[in-house]
């Protein structure tokens, strides 16, 4: 069964959490249909984003932190390891030193921390997708 | 009610055609939620746009063609009649020379015809909103 | 071996001007953000100014904001600050200094390599 | 204004003891410490960085830690060569830089 979208859910990561993500492309290619990953400081969504992770399907992929309101410097990968029209699954590790993205089990970006994992409070996943998963793992202390 | 989204709708269009549209942001407007018309020259979502029209609430609209799989010249306007998470109303008038968009009953945007507005067999609508309402009024000959 | 080596620091009147250079060698010059640090005598670090690695970005301390600019040239392996309508409390050792990793100016990460730095006296 | 990262002024540790440095008003629970020493008439050289972390060459007995508002740089049996001052740096933003006023390491 699908989750609303966008989907939002308090969480709180720290080195050893993943965040796993299944869905779809609402759209083809061509159309360019984007899916948003927002790590957040508070569980309002205008709040400041630890990692932002935007795919434009088909095209790119942009990685930034928005401080204090303000966007900072923009990563940027033509990778495109998601298939046109086919179910994908996404998982954000936290590394001690950076997160690591892998989709449909292979690592496809890294972006490094610039502000404490542990600053999280939210994720929010939109954007044109289905979601039909998402869950937040803790490594066992 | 909610109609879904992506909004799909067969439409035939002539100069006297209004296509209206009520909906709303699904995220505050620091978050670029967008918002995307598209005129399409078949059912299929792949098939050409005579009319593209694409909202980055706070920040742009671009408005475009796609002819044979193309993207042609984008034209950009700043202006930005949209209001932070409040519900809007969009009408797109065929003119005999151009489209007419009007937001709130404003006049916001025109975008001449590059193709015949009568190629034009279905209307999508999608991206980050909510929408409730969609109609395609015809003048009455 | 690294090497950052700082030039141009002199001593020039107020209201005057003065480019420091730092010319860099032992590591690929174009993959790392920089940023220059200055000591006033005796006094602690403060951090002036900072450039991503490809030149588009730039940051500075509210101090010297619209007086100094930072700017690079990747293809002469080189970090440049001009420093514009200085004053007396300009007078420090500035240092070159290069972040720990890549591309970005990450206070997380630090700055891992420093130059000994060069001397601007501002004085009439 | 920039942030304001405070330490004190002069720490005092006998040889072969425990050093302990703070450094005090910045938003550790968001952004990560490191912390440089420097030697009379030298650069400043990195000796911890993400709060913890220790760069390669650095001596074990150095270590650091944070919380709250809190960062801390900690020599475990400190040595004669450890006499130096020390500044902590963290971040107004990712990467707006800001350091603490130095501690001077005394008594060895």
């Known amino acids: 069964s699908l989750l609303p979208v966008p989907y939002t859910e308090a969480a709180s990561l720290s080195t050893g959490s993943t965040v796993t993500i299944k869905g779809r492309p609402l759209a083809c290619f061509l159309n360019e249909p984007y899916l948003q990953v927002d790590f957040h400081t508070e569980m309002k969504e205008e709040s400041d984003i630890v990692f932002h992770f935007q795919v434009c399907f088909g095209r790119r992929v942009v990685m930034n932190s928005r401080e204090y309101g303000a966007w900072k410097q923009q990563v940027e990968s033509k990778n495109m390891p998601f298939q046109d029209g086919q179910e994908f699954e996404l998982s954000i590790s936290v590394l001690p030193d950076k997160y690591q993205v892998m989709v449909n089990g292979q690592s496809s970006y890294t972006f490094d921390h610039r502000i404490k994992p542990e600053a999280v409070k939210m994720v929010q996943v939109w954007r044109d997708i289905s979601l039909t998963k998402f869950n937040v793992s803790y490594l066992k202390r | 009610s909610l109609l879904p989204v992506p909004y799909t709708e067969a439409a035939s269009l002539s100069t006297g055609s209004t296509v209206t549209i009520k909906g709303r942001p699904l995220a505050c407007f620091l978050n670029e939620p967008y918002l995307q018309v598209d005129f399409h020259t078949e059912m299929k979502e792949e098939s050409d746009i005579v009319f593209h029209f694409q909202v980055c609430f706070g920040r742009r609209v671009v408005m475009n063609s796609r002819e044979y799989g193309a993207w042609k010249q984008q034209v950009e306007s700043k202006n930005m009649p949209f209001q932070d998470g409040q519900e809007f109303e969009l009408s797109i008038s065929v003119l005999p020379d151009k489209y007419q968009v009007m937001v709130n009953g404003q006049s916001s945007y025109t975008f001449d015809h590059r193709i015949k507005p009568e190629a034009v067999k279905m209307v999508q609508v999608w991206r980050d909103i909510s929408l409730t309402k969609f109609n395609v009024s015809y003048l009455k000959r | 071996e690294l090497q950052l080596v700082e030039s141009g620091g002199g001593l020039v009147q107020p209201g005057g001007s003065l480019r420091l250079s730092c010319a860099a060698s032992g590591f690929t010059f174009s993959s790392y953000a920089m940023s220059w640090v200055r000591q006033a005598p005796g006094k602690g670090l403060e951090w002036v100014s900072n450039i991503n690695s490809g030149g588009g970005s730039t940051g500075y301390a509210d101090s010297v904001k619209g007086r100094f600019t930072i700017s690079r040239d990747n293809a002469k392996n080189t970090l440049y600050l001009q420093m514009n309508s200085l004053k007396p409390e300009d007078m420090a050792v500035y240092y070159c200094?290069?972040?720990?990793?890549?591309?970005?100016?990450?206070?997380?990460?630090?700055?891992?390599?420093w130059g000994k730095g060069t001397l601007v006296t501002v004085s009439s | 204004s920039q942030a304001v990262l405070t330490q004190p002024s002069a720490v005092s540790v006998s040889l072969g003891q425990t050093a302990r440095i703070t450094c005090q008003g910045g938003?550790?629970?968001?952004?990560?410490a490191s912390w440089y020493q420097q030697k009379p008439g030298q650069a400043p050289v990195l000796v911890i960085y993400?709060?913890?972390e220790r760069p390669s060459g650095i001596p074990e007995r150095f270590s650091g830690s944070s919380s709250g508002d809190t960062a801390t740089l900690t020599i475990s049996g400190a040595q004669a060569e450890d006499e130096a001052d020390y500044y902590c740096q963290s971040g107004r933003s990712s990467d707006n830089a800001v350091f603490g006023g130095g501690t001077h390491l005394t008594g060895l």
């Open positions: 200094a290069k972040y720990l990793r890549t591309y970005y100016p990450n206070a997380a990460f630090g700055m891992d390599y």
């Open positions: 938003n550790f629970g968001r952004y990560y």
């Open positions: 993400r709060d913890s």
